[in-house]
Every structure is written in C-alpha cells, then in structure tokens.
Amino acid sequence: PEMAQPVDPAHNVSRLHRLPRDCQELFQVGERQSGLFEIQPQGSPPFLVNCKMTSDGGWTVIQRRHDGSVDFNRPWEAYKAGFGDPHGEFWLGLEKVHSITGDRNSRLAVQLRDWDGNAELLQFSVHLGGEDTAYSLQLTAPVAGQLGATTVPPSGLSVPFSTWDQDHDLRRDKNCAKSLSGGWWFGTCSHSNLNGQYFRSIPQQRQKLKKGIFWKTWRGRYYPLQATTMLIQPMAAEAAS
C-alpha cells in the first residue's frame, strides 16, 4: 500500500531554502510547473505530492481514478497512509492531507467524468479533522451551484471517514464501507463514493452496482463514473499573482 516512488526527481525549489509546506506555497514563490514535488508541512516528515498549478494557485491532488489499475478496497491504515501510483491512480493518504490543511479551512475541488466524456467540476469549502475525529469532513460554506447539496453533508455537519475495518459512518444499521466498497466520508451510504470499485460497464446486479464510484446528484445514484480527481488547497488570501 506504499506510495510508489516517482520516476522523475521533484522540481528544484531553491528560492525557499527549505521544502515547501504545500503546493500553494510553491505557487506563491513563483513555481508554475505542475508535477511531483517533495513538500514538508509543519510538524510532518517530507513526502511527495502531485501539484497542479492553476489560476487559483497551487492545488494538491489527493485522489485520482481513471482506469481501475489500483485496488481501492483497503483498510483504515492504507487510507491513512496513502497508496497507489502518483503517475496513475492513487489516494494520497488522510494523514498527509491533514498535515497539509492543518487547522485551516480548505477548498476541495472534485472533477467527475462520465463514460460519455462529460465532466463537472465541483468546489467546496471544507475543514478536515485529524485522526482523533476519524478525519471528519465538514462543509464550512454553502455549496456553489445546484450540485452537491445532497451529496455532501449540510453545512456544519461533520462526517467521519469510514473503511470496512473502521466503521464511523452515520448509519447504525449497517457498515457503508462493507456494503459499498473502499473508504469514504460515507454519511448515510447513498450520497457519494469516489473510492468505490472501478467498473468499465454497468453491472446488472444492483448489489454489485452499489459498490461502484458514484456521485448521486450528478449522474445519479450508483452510476459508475469513468474518472475522478480530487484536489485540495488550504485557504488563505487568494494566491498572489
């Protein structure tokens, strides 16, 4: 479950005289290249991240799915530490993500893509708790647009992260991670799961269909998505031009 080592060396960031705290700090000191960088958030050991540099500054890619090459049905420790291939499908790791965001509110961007090639970009203002809160995700501002309102918890409600071996979901009668698949901020199981099983075609059996990658308010509950990317950026003032 370890994050694979990158083929390319991380870019040179000599201007800082230390490792950058995150992708946003890299952008703020003038880095405009996307790719793999070694960062070191406050109080954390160094680790590699995928940065995407945009007009909103530097984003850290925390999840990517597009071909089913990586098994996402993993236990708590794997979701905590991270797994996969930084050049392909991966989950960065909850502890790493939390070390990047710290106590700050953050922007979470989610790109969804269906099998017809249609894409939707969602953005949320969120707060991610530490392991003591089971990495609870809390919406800290109203959701932009019509999408997402029923897909993520209402503003203010915190949803813990759950895996099959650590059930923190909001359902008393079932373990969402077991009945679905993968680890996620499950809530009541039915709203979304971007870490589900990868399906190349729509399974006929509903029980299998439920285990897929879905985002209820976009293509419908249990429509198996073709690709997803999740990016995070700690909030401060907007990045300097």
């Epitope: 405009r32 290249q33 996307s34 945009t54 007009s55 790109q111 894409a119 932009a144 907007e238």
Partner: antibody, heavy 118, light 107 residues
Amino acid sequence: EVQLVESGGGLVQPGRSLKLSCAASGFTFSNYGMAWVRQTPTKGLEWVASISTGGGNTYYRDSVKGRFTISRDNAKNTQYLQMDSLRSEDTATYYCARDSTVDYFDYWGQGVMVTVSS
Amino acid sequence: DIQMTQSPSFLSASVGDRVTINCKASQKINKYLNWYQQKLGEAPKRLIYNTNNLQTGIPSRFSGSGSGTDFTLTISSLQPEDFATYCCLQHNSFPGTFGGGTKLELK
C-alpha cells in the same frame, strides 16, 4: 449545454480602449477559472490573460501587462477584458475560454474580432 | 517558458489516409497536453485532453499518445470533415503554451 458568448469587438484607433465581455451559461461559473486567448494568422493562438474563480488573482502575458485588465462578475456569469492603450499588434480574434483545472481549456466561445487601425 | 514545436506546419493528405501530427515540448510536461481542431471562422474545438483522452462527441478515429516531451495526434482514416487546422496546448506549466498549428489540406 456549456455556452460562452463574446461581445464588444470592433474597429478602434491605436491608443484607444475597448471592453470585451463573455457571457457564460450551462455550468456553475463560479467553480471555474476563466481566460482570454487571441489568434492572429501570423502568431497563431496565444494566451492573453487568466482570472481565478473568485476574481482575486489575475495573470497577463507580458505584452499586455499594464494595458489590459481581466475581471469577472460571478453574479452575472460574465467575464470581461478591458483593453486600454491598444496597439496595432493587438489586432486579433479574441476567444473566451473555460479553465477546468484538471485538463485546462475545455470550452471556447465563438470569438470576437478586434481591429486596431488608424 | 515552455516552447511547443509542432510539425509539420502544412500537411497534404487524401480521404482515408492515416495522418500523424507531432508536438515537441522544450521540457517535460507530464501528460498535460491537449489537442484542438479549428475550422475557418470557428472556435477551436478540443479533441484530446491530457495526452490520450478523447473529448465527448469526438470520433474514435482521433487518438493521442506520447509522454515526456514528445506527443502525437493520429487520425486513423481521414474523413472530408477533418481538413482543418490542428493545434496542441501544454498546460503543465501555467498559463500554458500553444503549438504553432498544422494546416491539414486535401491533396
């Protein structure tokens, strides 16, 4: 359906100003960065300016810095390009483009012609 | 700044031909390369995003490949409606740079 519609182009004398608009529909405008790209027969396509989702960050190609201003009004689903001190080399078709973050420019407007000539 | 060198600038081909257009970056750009098609008087239309992903509604005769600095757009069997100008865009380095374009003409 995603739609970007530019307006405001035309013929203008060197040194004068022009303001382009781009009306967006069919998507949640405030979730996307936006940009202006221009095209000439000699130089082809070239990026002109970009603006962040909230409008607080703006970026310009060197040749237009200090003369052009990109802005947006998320309530009106519209982005703008204020072009001052226009030069003959600014003559081009100007396109509005949507920046989808992960895979960059995915949708473009139909373009608007700007001609700077005396 | 990353320079994108596109070749050839002009290409003559016949209906049914297999055609390849190349884009070379002055440094590595990961997979962040898009291909666009533009017809006279129209806006650029994205064909391929991030090296090899086909955009919605684009026929499967279009494909993209490459890595590092060298990228290719392939049209497996040219159709009459494919005669147009093609352009690449790298977005590994913000705010991105375009190739010079390839005008595909009927032989």
